[in-house]
Amino acid sequence: SPSGVRLVGGLHRCEGRVEVEQKGQWGTVCDDGWDIKDVAVLCRELGCGAASGTPSGILYEPPAEKEQKVLIQSVSCTGTEDTLAQCEQEEVYDCSHDEDAGASCENPESSFSPVPEGVRLADGPGHCKGRVEVKHQNQWYTVCQTGWSLRAAKVVCRQLGCGRAVLTQKRCNKHAYGRKPIWLSQMSCSGREATLQDCPSGPWGKNTCNHDEDTWVECEDPFDLRLVGGDNLCSGRLEVLHKGVWGSVCDDNWGEKEDQVVCKQLGCGKSLSPSFRDRKCYGPGVGRIWLDNVRCSGEEQSLEQCQHRFWGFHDCTHQEDVAVICSG
C-alpha cells in the first residue's frame, strides 16, 4: 500500500494530479471509480480541508512522465478513512496516464502549505516573529520601516499562516540587523493583499534606508502545545495547536531530545524517558495529525523551533501519536 501521497501540477499543493509512493517510487492513480469520497479522504490526509472536486489528472502540467507508472487501478473509500492507504485498493492491471486521477480540495490556505518562499521573518523565535525579508530574483532583501504599517504586517502574517499581526514597537536589535541589500521602502498595503509582493511600494532597491530601519514584525503565532489523557498536565498524548486547531504529533524520529523540549516548554521538568508501552497507554488521538519527523537539538525553548515536515504533511496514523511523560 502507498507510503506517501501528493498532488502535483496544481495552482497550490491542495489540488493536482494524484500521485502515490510505493517502494520509493512515485506513480499515479487510475480514475476507475474515483469519486468525491476518495478525494475527501485524500484532502483529509494532506490537511487540505474539504473535497471540492474530482478533476481529470490530465489537466495538470507537466503531465506524468512516460517512465512513470500508474500504480493503483482503483480506490474505493467510504469517506471516513484518515488516509488513502486505509481505503480498499486494487493494484493496476490496465490503465494509462490519460486516466490519471485528479483531486481538488477547498482549503489550500497558507497554514497548510509550505512556508511561502517569497517572504520570511528572520532571526526571531520561530517563523512567526522576526525581521521581514523578501525574496527577489533568488536574493533575500530586508524591508525598510519607512511607510510600513500594521496593514502591511497583516499581509505578512497571513502570507506566513501565522495568524493576526501584533502591534509592536519592537525594533531589530543590533545582532538581528540585516546584512542583506535593502529591498524597498514605502510599502503601501491595504491589508487585503494575498502577498507582500502585491502591495504597492517605492522603486526596487532605490531608497536611503540603512539596516537600523529594518522592519520587525510579530504575529500572534497560534502555536501552543498540551499533554492530554494523563493524570496531570505533565503527562499524556502530545497535541499541538496550529491555526486554532489541536492535532497530534507522529512518533517518526521522536526521541529523548524532543521529549526534553516539550517538558521544558510546558515547565514540567525533565522527561522521564518513558518506555514504548507506557507511551501507548494514552491511546490514539482523533482529528488532525499536524507534525511529523520532528527533530530537535534539545536546546530549543519551543517545539516550534525544532525542524519538522510542513504542517499537515505526514505518513502516519493515530496509532503513531506521540506521548510524553515529564517529571512534573
Epitope: T28, K66, L71, V92, Y93, C95
Partner: antibody, heavy 116, light 111 residues
C-alpha cells in the same frame, strides 16, 4: 466496425515485410491496437501495441525486430530481417475500449511465410 | 519474464458436461487475466477479462475465477459449439510498460 489485415506473402529470409491493418468504424486516435501472431499449429504470441496517442510498446523478444506505425485508418507492422521462425498468421486486434492489454475485436489474420 | 502454464493440454467431455481449465502464472499477477476462445481458421474471441468479468455477449456458462497465480476457466452445460482451443492471457498496462503473455492453450473436444 471492421479490422482487416493484408500484406501477408511468401518472403525470403533476411528480406523486409510490412503488414497493414485497415480499420473501419474505429477511431485510431482513441483506441489501442495490437499485433499478434500464431505459428501453424501453435499458440498465440503478442508482438506489440500502439496506443491512440501514438506511443508503442513491444514484447521483449520483438523489440528491434518489429516496428508499428499508423495513419488515420491503418496500423502497419514492419518486420525486418525475417527468419523461418517468423512464419505465422499475423493478427491485428483492437483493445477493449478504454483499455490497452486485452482485445475484443480481431481481424481474420494474414499468413506470412518465410522460406527460401 | 512471466510464464503462463495451462492444464490440461487437451480435454474431452460430453455435451452437457463441465470442463475446468487451469492457468498458472509464474508470479503473482493479481486479477490481470483474460480468457479467449479460438476455433480453427478463426481469430480469438475474448470471453473473460480481469479474471472473472464476462465480456459482452458471452453466456454465463463460462465462468472465470482465481487471482494471484492460480486461475480457472469453467465451462458448464457444454455445447457442441464450445469445441475450440482456449487461451489464458496476462493483461497488464501501467502507462510505462505493457506485459501481455499467453498460455499454451487447452483444446476442448465435445463428444
Amino acid at each position: 466496425q471492421s479490422v482487416e489485415e493484408s500484406g501477408g506473402r511468401l518472403v525470403m529470409p533476411g528480406g523486409s515485410l510490412t503488414l497493414t491493418c485497415t480499420v473501419s468504424g474505429i477511431d485510431l486516435s482513441s483506441n489501442t491496437m495490437g499485433w499478434f501472431r500464431q505459428a501453424p499449429g501453435k499458440g498465440l504470441e503478442w508482438i506489440g501495441i500502439m496506443r491512440g496517442g501514438g506511443s508503442t510498446y513491444y514484447a521483449t523478444w520483438a523489440k528491434g525486430r518489429f516496428t508499428i506505425s499508423k495513419t488515420s485508418t491503418t496500423v502497419d507492422l514492419k518486420l525486418t530481417s525475417p527468419t523461418t521462425e517468423d512464419t505465422a498468421t499475423y493478427f491485428c486486434a483492437r483493445a477493449f475500449p478504454g483499455y490497452n492489454s486485452f482485445f475484443n475485436f480481431w481481424g481474420q489474420g494474414t499468413l506470412v511465410t518465410i522460406s527460401s | 519474464e512471466l510464464d503462463l502454464t495451462q492444464t490440461p493440454a487437451s480435454v474431452s467431455e460430453p455435451v452437457g458436461g463441465t470442463v475446468t481449465i487451469k492457468c498458472q502464472a509464474s508470479h503473482n499477477i493479481n486479477s490481470a487475466l483474460a480468457w479467449y476462445q479460438q476455433k480453427p481458421g478463426q481469430p480469438p474471441k475474448l470471453l473473460i477479462y480481469k479474471a472473472s468479468t464476462l465480456a459482452s455477449g458471452v453466456p454465463p456458462r463460462f465462468k472465470g475465477s482465481g487471482s494471484g497465480t492460480e486461475f480457472t476457466l469453467t465451462i458448464s452445460d457444454l455445447e457442441c459449439a464450445d469445441a475450440a482451443t482456449y487461451y489464458c492471457q496476462r493483461h497488464y498496462f501501467d502507462g510505462a510498460s505493457a506485459d501481455i503473455a499467453f498460455g499454451g492453450g487447452t483444446e476442448v473436444v465435445v463428444k
